[in-house]
Each structure stands twice: as structure tokens, then as C-alpha cells.
């Protein structure tokens, strides 16, 4: 509900400064508060526009201040208007000269329809002139000069709504600036009644509250609050929730408070008089000091709050036993809350006695929408109301108000909500590399739309056309590897950014699709690499029978060990060999192979071979004769790699015998480096030659080696060994 209050500071204008302050308490008007002259009430008042300024001491308040030199132009009727969600509330008041010939008994007077009413003005200046009374600027009554009484009255024996208006009194020779004003407010309904047809019963509006004839609600006087105005505010506070404060040294002295009709204007509790500068007499309290304390147990009467009940007593006159009521207090509500757009569950927590019920706790949005709790619970000391906003959006940012209204009083706590836009990447992630079971991704998390800072990032992925949930991994770097993917599968990828706070997960960004490679076939089996010539090698393998229908081929990679020379050859899948040509003689090559479909297969182990030599082989080196016995000896040697040495020949004969009497031992496995000669004669000298053969021919031994066998009885000498052919 709108809580609009107009403070008329000194309605009787003298030479001092005077002001009007209009306060929108506890709500944020959609349109500016306006203060203007009320020409409906007084047509012929001053026409000067008002200089309305922002009241710097309050967030939603406007002010008009008249300096003392403007005093002559102030007389008249004024209004303040506030609007929220199409509803307008207008509050009216008046200002008049303190030096007027008459003064009203009260600034406003609220009566019920049918009441017997006397509107009275006190004569303060005696003149030999007729007195005249006007209503809304139109003449209604005059009193001859010799009959003007001390109290000039307008009598309405049976007041009707049409009798309402601004009544003014002056001497006939006076004018607007010597007139006294009072406003009569006639409730549309008879006493204790409300409703369009005035046939509903009002609740009791305590402490001089007034029952609103349209809604049945109580309009509480300044200094009281709650549904029935039973609860006194803290000292020097006012407003529907008592959260506005009078800043004067003596509290609300000299402040005339005007509230929406049918309340009208009154002093704050504890004060009386047209200027609200007179304190209540002992035993009286409340607005205009109209309420009398009748404290049951001799409790003290406070002019602001009424009876101050002893512990264990409550009620206006301390007539009821029970725990004294405690004004509700809102607790644990921060001044500022940052919220992520989406679902929002604000919490209002309040203490007080009796504890607030869920009907008594509301949340007011910046646009004035009143929300009721979705959930409610209470402990011994607190009530907790949980509200639900299914979709809060940035336009909902602003001042929200938690409001608690119990029989013990009302409290409101404004707090600022800042609604953040959830972040969302502008670009899809990029796929840098893929295999049959992995993908390397650049998540491209920036730039993004929405609000940061980004707390975490998720990479979401799932196979396309699968009814699987999205899987995700938390990501810290921009480059990330996804493992354990299915081969030959199309995947969808996107990135979700998370900002701080509950519900900070943004919408996933644009989607990227990619397909993993097929799983690689195993390498060919039975691979064999042999030299074919000085410039060719032959690679062979067993026939390949693939498991799928896919086309396949064999990829052969050969590279030279000596030179930086590499070549890849594609061989149709139905072949079982390939001739590697254009090679260099006497060069070592490393070869490997794999079977490829659309996906690449696994490489085989490396195979190594030399091309055939283009020169004679060098002589075997490190030739040693050892383990000599009476009939045997061991010959060992080494050969150089790379000369296509295919065999080693050992030639021996008894010294002195003819050349043609030699024996040749041909060792066809060139990896063997040791041989035992057997069947030799004891105590005999032999001439031994050893040479290597390759595709070009045999090596040329430079000299012969001598071997002398031992006599029959002598033990052999062990001179080491190597690989031995027996």
C-alpha cells in the first residue's frame, strides 16, 4: 500500500520560514511526487508556480520552502499527489496568516455521514465589520457586525458528503490573506460503516485512527501503527511502519501531519494546537492530545504512547494479562543483494511478539507489486517467510521492501536488489584436433554476453542423436582435451559459464559439432623387409582381411638413417608387397607400415634393412685364434655393417702344402662372428685366411694367419669367444 504523508510545518504563517514536505514512505513512486495549489478548494488563491525541490534528507520526498519575505503569497490550499501502479493518492492541506482575524479550531475535521457538526472559528481580532463565511471560495453565510461572537460557528445538523470542503472566515472588508481556513471531511458512510453501499462494519481504529470508507482499513495517526492502530511507535517516529523520524530537537513539535482522506491533518502523538507546538496535558496523549489515559493499575501515562504497562500486562489501558507485545523487527536482511536472473527465493526473517504469521509478512517489489510468502516457518524467536519469484530479471533491480504488519506494530526494511544477466559465450568452442577417442578443444569462453565475473566454466558434450544427458567437465584453461570418446561418433559441444551466487549457471553458448575418427586397424602381419638391389628394398606382408566394408590401403613409411630423407607410399589393400626403389646403395633404411581406412591405423614396429652394396666388402677385422687344442681351434672376427655381407669364408691348409689342398668353410649367416675348426692334426702348423663376401664379390685378405695345434696330451688355452658355429 502507498504511504504518502504531507507535513505542513507551521500552517499559520508569520514572518518565519514555512514549508510543505511530501514523503513517499516505504515505496518507490513510478512518477514523481507532485506538490501543487489546490484550486478545487480555493479558486481565487495566488497563481505563482511553486518551487518544488527534492528533500535531501529523505530518498522519496519533495519539499516547498517559503522564505519569510514570501509570507504574503502563501495563503491558500495545497495538495501532494503520489502515484503507483495506476493508483493516485492526493493529500490536501492549507496555510493561512497567523495575523488573520479568525483562527480555526482545527486545520481539518473528519466526521461521519449524518453527524451533527459544528465548524468553529475563534475571533482573534475585533472589528466593526460583518463576518462572512465561505465554502470553497463561495459565500454561504454572514453575521452582522454587532452579532459576531467569540466563536464563529457553521452548524450542520446532519452532515452529508456534499458538505465537505474548505470553509473560510473573515471580516467582510478583509480578503484571502486575512482569511482563516478549515477543511471539513465527511466520510461517505455513517459511523463504523464502510463499503460502496456503506453496509459493512469497520474494525475498531484505535488511538483516533479513521476507518477508510472504501476499504475498511484503518488510517493510523502519526505515531501509531498496525491493522487497528493499537501499537504506538517508538518516540518521534511516524509512518505506516514508524520508520520515518522527526529530526527536530523536540521530535515532531511544530509538524502538522496530513494523511489521505478521510484522515485529514493532525499533530503527531504528544502534541496539540494549530501549530502542533503545545505538549499534551498530564493524563492525555495521542494526536492532538485527544486521547485520555485510563491506565488500569495506576501505570504511568506517556503523552506519546499512552499507558506504559507493567510486565505481564497489555492493551490500551493495560487491561489484559499476557506477554507484552513487541514490535516486529526484521533481521538478517542485507542492505544489498546481488541476484542472478532466473528463479529467486528471497527470505524475510522477523522477530516480535506475537510472532508474525505468514499473512502478516509481505515483500514489495520496486513496481509496487505485493508478494506473499510461498513458504513459511517459525522457531521460538523468529518467523521466516520465503517468497518465490520464478523469473527475476534485470528490470526488477531496485529497492525491494520486506514488510511485517502484526497487532504489535508494523516494520518495513528496504533493501537493494541488483539482478545480474547470466553469462553466455558468444562463440562456439573450436575443435583443434581429434582422434578416435579424444578431441582437443579451444573453449572460446570470451567474449561473452551478460555479467561477470566468471567463477567457473563447464564444457558440455554429448553424442548427437543419442538420448543421453549432456556430460560436462570443469575447465580452467582455454584449451582442454576430452578423453574417452566413442570412435566415429558425431558429438555436440558447448560451453556454460558460471558466475558467482546461487543460480549462476548461464545458458550454454553456441553448439559446435565434430566427429571422432574411426578406430585404427592393426598393422599388417608378417612384415618382412629385404634388400632387392643396390637401390631397392622389398617389403612383404600377409594378406589383409578387414572386418568392415570400408575401403582400406596400406601406408608404408620409409626413412633413411643416414640422411634426412623420408617417403610415404600408399599401397592398395589387396597387395601383399611393395618394392621401395630409388634408394641409395649401401644405405640403412627404417620402414614401418599401417592399414588405413577413413581412420588411420596403428603403425607397425620399425623394420631396418640396408640396400645392397656397390663396392667389395672390407676385410673382417679383429681376427683372433683361440682355444687351440691338438685337433681344434676357435677363430673369431668382426665385420662392418652396411656392406651387404652375405657370408664369411674361412680357408685353411697345412703350411707348405699346395694351394689346391686348402679347405673352405663358408658361413652363410653373416651375424655369426666365431667358428671352431675341428679335425686338425696335432703339432701341425696351418695357414688360415678369412674373407667376407657380398653381392659384388669377396674381400681381399692382406695377410694370412698361422695356427699351430698342440701335442695330444696338452690342455687347451681359453682365449675368449663370441658367437660360434660348431
Amino acid at each position: 500500500a502507498m504511504d504518502l504523508i504531507l507535513i505542513n510545518s507551521l500552517p499559520l504563517v508569520s514572518d518565519a520560514e514555512t514549508s510543505l514536505t511530501c514523503i513517499a514512505s516505504g515505496w518507490r513512486p513510478h512518477e514523481p511526487i507532485t506538490i501543487g495549489r489546490d484550486f478545487e478548494a480555493l479558486m481565487n488563491q495566488h497563481q505563482d508556480p511553486l518551487e518544488v525541490t527534492q528533500d535531501v534528507t529523505r530518498e522519496w520526498a519533495k519539499k516547498v520552502v517559503w522564505k519569510r519575505e514570501k509570507a504574503s503569497k502563501i495563503n491558500g490550499a495545497y495538495f501532494c499527489e503520489g502515484r503507483v501502479r495506476g493508483e493516485a493518492i492526493r493529500i490536501r492541506t492549507m496555510k493561512m496568516r497567523q495575523q488573520a482575524s479568525f483562527l480555526p479550531a482545527t486545520l481539518t475535521m473528519t466526521v461521519d455521514k449524518g453527524d451533527n457538526v459544528n465548524i468553529s472559528f475563534k475571533k482573534v481580532l475585533i472589528k466593526e465589520e460583518d463576518a462572512v463565511i465561505y465554502k470553497n471560495g463561495s459565500f454561504i453565510h454572514s453575521v452582522p457586525r454587532h452579532e459576531v461572537p467569540d466563536i464563529l460557528e457553521v452548524h450542520l445538523p446532519h452532515a452529508q458528503p456534499q458538505d465537505a470542503g474548505v470553509y473560510s472566515a473573515r471580516y467582510i472588508g478583509g480578503n484571502l490573506f486575512t482569511s482563516a481556513f478549515t477543511r471539513l471531511i465527511v466520510r461517505r458512510c455513517e459511523a463504523q460503516k464502510w463499503g460502496p453501499e456503506c453496509n459493512h462494519l469497520c474494525t475498531a481504529c484505535m488511538n483516533n485512527g479513521v476507518c477508510h470508507e472504501d476499504t475498511g482499513e484503518c488510517i493510523c495517526p502519526p505515531g501509531f501503527m498496525g491493522r487497528t492502530c493499537e501499537k504506538a511507535c517508538e518516540l518521534h517516529t511516524f509512518g505506516r511502519t514508524c520508520k520515518e523520524r522527526c529530526s527536530g530537537q523536540e521530535g515532531c513539535k511544530s509538524y502538522v501531519f496530513c494523511l489521505p482522506d478521510p484522515y485529514g491533518c493532525s499533530c503527531a502523538t504528544g502534541w496539540k494546537g494549530l501549530q502542533c507546538n503545545e505538549a499534551c496535558h498530564p493524563g492525555f496523549y495521542g494526536p492532538d492530545c485527544k486521547l485520555r489515559c485510563s491506565c488500569n493499575n495506576g501505570e504511568m501515562c506517556d503523552r506519546f504512547q499512552g499507558c506504559l504497562c507493567s510486565p505481564g500486562w497489555q492493551g490500551l489501558q493495560c487491561e489484559r494479562e499476557g506477554i507484552p507485545r513487541m514490535t516486529p523487527k526484521i533481521v538478517d536482511l542485507p542492505d544489498h543483494i546481488e541476484v542472478n536472473s532466473g528463479k529467486f527465493n528471497p527470505i524475510c526473517k522477523a522477530s516480535g511478539w506475537p510472532l508474525p504469521t505468514n499473512e502478516e509478512m509481505t515483500l514489495v517489489k520496486p513496481d509496487g507489486t505485493v508478494l506473499h510468502p510461498k513458504d513459511f516457518n517459525h522457531t521460538d524467536h523468529f518467523s521466516v517467510a520465503i517468497f518465490t519469484i520464478h523469473r527475476i530479471l534485470p528490470p526488477d533491480s531496485g529497492v525491494w521492501v520486506c514488510s511485517v504488519n502484526t497487532v504489535a506494530g508494523m516494520v518495513e526494511k528496504p533493501f537493494n536488489i541488483s539482478v545480474k544477466v547470466l553469462p553466455k559465450p558468444l562463440n562456439a568452442p573450436n575443435v583443434i584436433d581429434t582422434g578416435h577417442n579424444f578431441a582437443v578443444i579451444n573453449i572460446s569462453s570470451e567474449p561473452y554476453f551478460g555479467d561477470g565475473p566468471i567463477k567457473s566454466k563447464k564444457l558440455l558434450y554429448k553424442p548427437v542423436n543419442h538420448y543421453e544427458a549432456w556430460q560436462h567437465i570443469q575447465v580452467t584453461n582455454e584449451i582442454v582435451t576430452l578423453n574417452y570418446l566413442e570412435p566415429r561418433t558425431e558429438y555436440e559441444l558447448c560451453v556454460q559459464l558460471v558466475r558467482r551466487g546461487e543460480g549462476g549457471e548461464g545458458h550454454p553458448g553456441p553448439v559446435r559439432r565434430f566427429t571422432t575418427a574411426s578406430i585404427g586397424l592393426p598393422p599388417p602381419r608378417g612384415l618382412n623387409l629385404l634388400p632387392k638391389s643396390q637401390t631397392t628394398l622389398n617389403l612383404t606382408w600377409q594378406p589383409i582381411f578387414p572386418s568392415s566394408e570400408d575401403d582400406f590401403y596400406v601406408e608404408v613409411e620409409r626413412r633413411s638413417v643416414q640422411k634426412s630423407d623420408q617417403q610415404n607410399i600408399k599401397v592398395p589393400g589387396n597387395l601383399t608387397s611393395v618394392l621401395l626403389n630409388n634408394l641409395h646403395p649401401r644405405e640403412q633404411y627404417v620402414v614401418r607400415a599401417r592399414v588405413n581406412t577413413k581412420a588411420q591405423g596403428e603403425w607397425s614396429e620399425d623394420l631396418t634393412a640396408w640396400t645392397l652394396s656397390d663396392i667389395l666388402p672390407p676385410q673382417p677385422e679383429n681376427i683372433k685364434i683361440s682355444n687351440i687344442t691338438h685337433s681344434s681351434a676357435v677363430i673369431s672376427w668382426t665385420i662392418l655393417d652396411g656392406y651387404s655381407i652375405s657370408s664369411i669364408t674361412i680357408r685353411y691348409k697345412v703350411q707348405g702344402k699346395n694351394e689346391d689342398q686348402h679347405v673352405d668353410v663358408k658361413i652363410k649367416n653373416a651375424t655369426i662372428t666365431q667358428y671352431q675348426l675341428k679335425g686338425l692334426e696335432p703339432e701341425t702348423a696351418y695357414q688360415v685366411d678369412i674373407f667376407a663376401e657380398n653381392n659384388i664379390g669377396s674381400s681381399n685378405p692382406a695377410f694370412s694367419h698361422e695356427l699351430v695345434t698342440l701335442p695330444e696330451s696338452q690342455a687347451p688355452a681359453d682365449l675368449g669367444g663370441g658367437k660360434m658355429l660348431l
Partner: antibody
């Protein structure tokens, strides 16, 4: 918590009388007007009577006028409905209720009245 | 007295679907001075007293889920449940308080289809 606890229901013969009570707690009873509403078996809701907060004003539905009397004792936080010359058509569940404006906000648990010979 | 007529008398709606209950008054419940409709809605479950859902035709009572909404003006009013839940099975009543005596509609029984 605001509560309205009802008592006084039962079976009664036509033409006889019965008194219903409604005890209020958790609110300043003396500040609120109070209503009685009834509901015949399997039927809708029918407003019966209302009394002002101070007991000065009382209003009745035409169907009960002259036979039923609404009253209150603010010192005891108690609302009553005195029902005389009962008829079979008065058979119903009777509820006391507090208003929120013109709507009825807090209801008692209801009490069953059966008028039967 | 102002007569209130509800339609339909009973209604079966699937869970999660929208339920709509209408209420017509024999004279306008709109007060032109403040543009307010003097109409309330109640929910009554078996063996329980009625529970206030809405007042001023569209103001949700505290603690009432926001799937309930009220609309309409003058003589024609609607209570809508946007997504029916199992716990919404009840009888629903409209009530005018434009003029005394306050009067209720005959009720609409809402069930699950």
C-alpha cells in the same frame, strides 16, 4: 497465531434452542467485527450474521432474522450465536470468521448442528 | 441482495493443465470511485473451513501459491489455476462484498481428470 475455536454443536429437535460459541486468541478480539457463516450438507456457503467490534451493531440474514441472536463478550474474547426456534433447514456446519476488509480471513474449525425430530 | 453464479458446477482437469472457474454477479462489484472490485475467492477442501485465496478480485492472499490468479471486473470474474496440482482438488467459491449481506456463489467442484 490467530485462532478461532468453536464449541456448542449437536443434535436438537425442531423448535428448540442451541447456543454456539467461538473463542478467539492471537488477536485483539475487541477490535474486530465477527461473522457467522453456515453450510448445509452438500451445499454452498451462506452468510448468517455479523456483529460490530463493540457489539453495538448487529445484522442478520433474512432466513434467521428474529430467531438467531449474535453477541460477544470482549472481556472473554468470546463470540456467541443464540439459535432459537430451530428448523430442519438450519441443519448445517456453522463457522465463525474474522474479516479482512469484506473478505473472511480467519475461520473457525466449524461446528455441526443437526435439527431433527 | 446481489446474486453470485458460478460456472461450471464441476470441472475435471488433467494434472499440470490450466483450470478456469467463472463467477458472475447480478450487479457490478466494481466501485468506480477507487476502481476496485469487491470480490473474493475461497478454496474449501473436504472437512475443512474455507480458505481465503483472493480479495479485491486479483490480490492473492498471503501464502497462496502463485499458480492461482484472479481476473475480471464489473460483473464477470475468473479464478485461474495455471498448472493444476493434486492438492488443488477442492470446491471453489466466489463472494462479493460490494454490498451487505455478503453473498457466495454456489461453488465449483474441481477434480482431476
Amino acid at each position: 497465531q490467530v485462532q478461532l475455536v468453536q464449541s456448542g454443536g449437536g443434535v436438537v429437535q425442531p423448535g428448540r434452542s442451541l447456543r454456539l460459541s467461538c473463542a478467539a486468541s492471537g488477536l485483539t478480539f475487541s477490535n474486530y467485527a465477527m461473522h457467522w457463516v453456515r453450510q448445509a450438507p452438500g451445499k454452498g456457503l451462506e452468510w448468517v450474521a455479523v456483529i460490530s467490534y463493540d457489539g453495538e451493531n448487529k445484522y442478520y440474514a433474512d432466513s434467521v432474522k428474529g430467531r438467531f441472536t449474535i453477541s460477544r463478550d470482549n472481556s472473554k474474547n468470546m463470540l456467541q450465536l443464540q439459535m432459537n426456534r430451530l428448523r430442519s433447514e438450519d441443519t448445517a456446519v456453522y463457522y465463525c470468521a474474522t474479516p479482512k476488509g469484506g473478505a473472511l480471513e480467519i475461520w473457525g474449525q466449524g461446528t455441526v448442528i443437526t435439527v431433527s425430530s | 441482495d446481489i446474486q453470485m453464479t458460478q460456472s461450471p458446477d464441476s470441472l475435471a482437469v488433467s494434472l499440470g493443465e490450466r483450470a478456469t472457474i467463472n463467477c458472475k454477479s447480478s450487479q457490478s462489484a466494481l466501485y468506480s470511485s477507487n476502481n476496485k472490485n469487491y470480490l473474493a475467492w475461497y478454496q474449501q477442501k473436504p472437512g475443512q473451513p474455507p480458505n481465503l485465496l483472493m480479495y479485491w478480485a486479483s490480490t492473492r492472499e498471503s501464502g497462496v501459491p502463485d499458480r492461482f490468479s484472479g481476473s475480471g471486473s464489473g460483473t464477470d470474474f475468473t479464478l485461474t489455476i495455471s498448472s493444476l496440482q493434486a492438492e488443488d482438488v477442492a470446491v471453489y467459491y466466489c463472494q462479493q462484498y460490494y454490498s451487505a449481506p455478503i453473498t457466495f456463489g454456489q461453488g465449483t467442484r474441481l477434480e482431476i481428470k
